[in-house]
Amino acid sequence: DSSKWVFEHPETLYAWEGACVWIPCTYRALDGDLESFILFHNPEYNKNTSKFDGTRLYESTKDGKVPSEQKRVQFLGDKNKNCTLSIHPVHLNDSGQLGLRMESKTEKWMERIHLNVSERPFPPHIQLPPEIQESQEVTLTCLLNFSCYGYPIQLQWLLEGVPMRQAAVTSTSLTIKSVFTRSELKFSPQWSHHGKIVTCQLQDADGKFLSNDTVQLNVKHTPKLEIKVTPSDAIVREGDSVTMTCEVSSSNPEYTTVSWLKDGTSLKKQNTFTLNLREVTKDQSGKYCCQVSNDVGPGRSEEVFLQVQYAPEPSTVQILHSPAVEGSQVEFLCMSLANPLPTNYTWYHNGKEMQGRTEEKVHIPKILPWHAGTYSCVAENILGTGQRGPGAELDVQYPPKKVTTVIQNPMPIREGDTVTLSCNYNSSNPSVTRYEWKPHGAWEEPSLGVLKIQNVGWDNTTIACAACNSWCSWASPVALNVQYAPRDVRVRKIKPLSEIHSGNSVSLQCDFSSSHPKEVQFFWEKNGRLLGKESQLNFDSISPEDAGSYSCWVNNSIGQTASKAWTLEVLYAPRRLRVSMSPGDQVMEGKSATLTCESDANPPVSHYTWFDWNNQSLPYHSQKLRLEPVKVQHSGAYWCQGTNSVGKGRSPLSTLTVYYSPETIGRR
């Protein structure tokens, strides 16, 4: 309704004698700002005076004067929206109705708030979830409909009177909607908490007790069991009797079924709290427990380990590992079911007792071929001696032994011969399956362990074979000692170190890389002509005419080998120079004359110099000198000089005659 003032605040506020009350409040006036405010206790409307009667706890007027007794009550609001109040301390007789009389310029309003003040601090309230199960986390809530800024309080949780270790989360609310203090505790109850008392205790700031609330925990849990056995150590011999009893120490709700388990498997027709085992056998050894169920689930007792003792059974031998490789380590394990465990063992190798071996395991650190055979054992405990089992076979494997490579040919072997070799060995386990040869070659193996080398190479120095099973054993290499004609024959210049110039002393060496047999002869030839029979060919003073193609031959008792042809090049300065003239040495004036400098040189002439009859050099450097147009004055003797990297050479004089043309003669 638009004619009402709008207020928001908690409907009722709770406190106790000596505490305080904080009243959160908001309002919206109908028009303008608040001009007057009076707080009544239990106001009543007087129709005669058209005013409210009652105790005035607080009054504020236009002039702003406030009576001095009003310090206990405080208006913390303002002139347009906040109407929050505080009473500190609060007294029992403050209980009842508080009336907020508000006046603006033209409007008035009375707003009522209930105040409930008790004589003593009222207790908080504990809230529990509908069901609590063991080991499942729950939240316990303690709620108190009180909070005031001027009166700090605390909520503490106790289990069976002892403060709880878990950290609680405390929250407060002082709003227009609600005023409270709340404590929340997260807690994982165990079955042992069932029936225990939980307390939420209200305390003042100093920890002084004010009030509390208590609840009894109802923790649902599976049955908790204890198992008892006779005899108490659960150790018996075959034929003895055993009794086991199951006791329920706690169950919530009540249990419904009972069963017994052996090694995790349910025992048929055993549904009472007592399990009787008569004349036990060794097969009944194992781990026993009882299982009792309720609506929460099954509960199991601790396990009882029943040991039925008996003499060792026939033994078996386990070998780690067979087949074994020679040189490796091997372990033998004697396996015999017995209770108690065997205390003594006797070992046998091929039926013969192994001295000094009394342990469950026999360790041989380095296996040799003679360790092969059958291994068996006998186990012994306090109840007797077992029987010897069938035993286990140890197979010792090793590479082929004493491998040798044998040449089948008559000696000596010559390059190009066919050579046959065989690969022999003494013993092997497992059997030899293949052979290898070193070096590798495209050779024939006509049968296993035989190698045929067709057209044996000069460089087939040694051959080795290997006989192979799982491993290869190599024989020492055998020398073929192949005989061959001299190899890699070549001509080598040993003097001079640089290029050969005419007049030099020259030495050529006939080199070869190898020969077998080593005794050799040499032959030198040039253009099919024999020059010498030494390893060196010497020229005291070389001439250009010695240039040409040289070969040397080296022979031994197997054959002879020739070098590649080697070209001997002789460098010399230009020689045999001459000037030739074209079209001839007599030319008519006005025509052209070409002079050519001809020479023999190695390397070829790089440039030429031309001279006239007065030895004056002409500015030409090429092989040809062209005079065009030629003049009578050009008549005379010309000569040329050729130059190469070795030196210079000059020609004799050649005379050019230039005669007058008919026109010139006609003019004279």
Epitope: S606, H607, D612, W613, N614, Q616, S617, L618, P619, Y620, H621, S622, K624, R626, L627, P629, K631, Q633, H634, G636
Partner: antibody, heavy 119, light 107 residues
């Protein structure tokens, strides 16, 4: 100090004869270690050697094949100079013409004459 | 006729750079190879004669090498006044022939 001074017309009509003179100072045209050359330069042909005259025990001439039928290079010992005559010129003969001494390379050059062949 | 081929035909460089110009003859000319520098509007100037000999008055940063058919002109550290056109020329036989020139410009 050798100097070469060129003289002659800068404009010649087509089919006429181009005549240039190169006066030598600091050396002799009759030197038996030098050769006296004419070289021309145009954007289309670059540097082009035309010919030379030189004296050893007699006077000699060498000419480029491209101008052999039209060129004459003459020494004038009395004036210590040498000349170039190029007959039947065409616009293709338009170029800067240089005279140069050759001892070991063209070590001295004239100042150059721009000759334009135009009607 | 002997043909002279210069490479490159032009190149850009900076002051202080080392520059190399090559010249190849169509046949062997021994060491009868000369190098010239020409600036616009001026006659060519002889730098190197007989392939490697420095002409009198030419700075030592210029050097020449080669014989036969392949020749090189090197400027060891370019100076501002070195930007010009360079020519090679053979004097082995007539007709005397020049290379087409290499234009060296500032980068």
């Amino acid at each position: 100090q050798v100097q070469l001074q060129q003289s002659g017309p800068g404009l010649v009509k087509p089919s006429q004869t181009l005549s240039l003179t190169c006066a030598i100072s600091g050396d002799s045209v009759s030197s038996n270690s030098a050769a006296w050359n004419w070289i021309r330069q145009s954007p289309s042909r670059g540097l082009e050697w035309l010919g030379r005259t030189y004296y050893r025990s007699a006077w000699y001439n060498d000419y480029a094949v491209s101008v052999k039928s039209r060129i004459t290079i003459n020494p004038d010992t009395s004036k210590n100079q040498f000349s170039l005559q190029l007959s039947s010129v065409t616009p293709e003969d338009t170029a800067v013409y240089y005279c140069a001494r050759d001892v070991e390379g063209f070590d001295y050059w004239g100042q150059g004459t721009l000759v334009t062949v135009s009607g | 006729d002997i043909v002279m081929t210069q490479t490159p035909s032009s190149l850009s460089a900076s002051v202080g750079d080392r520059v190399t110009i090559t010249c190849r003859a169509s046949q062997s000319i021994s060491s009868y190879l000369n190098w010239y520098q020409q600036k616009p509007g001026k006659a060519p100037k002889l730098l190197i004669y007989a392939a490697s000999s420095l002409q009198s008055g030419v700075p030592s940063r210029f050097s020449g090498s080669g014989s036969g058919t392949d020749f090189t002109l090197t400027i060891s550290s370019l100076q501002p006044e070195d930007f010009a056109t360079y020519y090679c020329q053979q004097s082995y036989s007539t007709p005397i022939t020049f290379g087409q020139g290499t234009r060296l410009e500032i980068k």
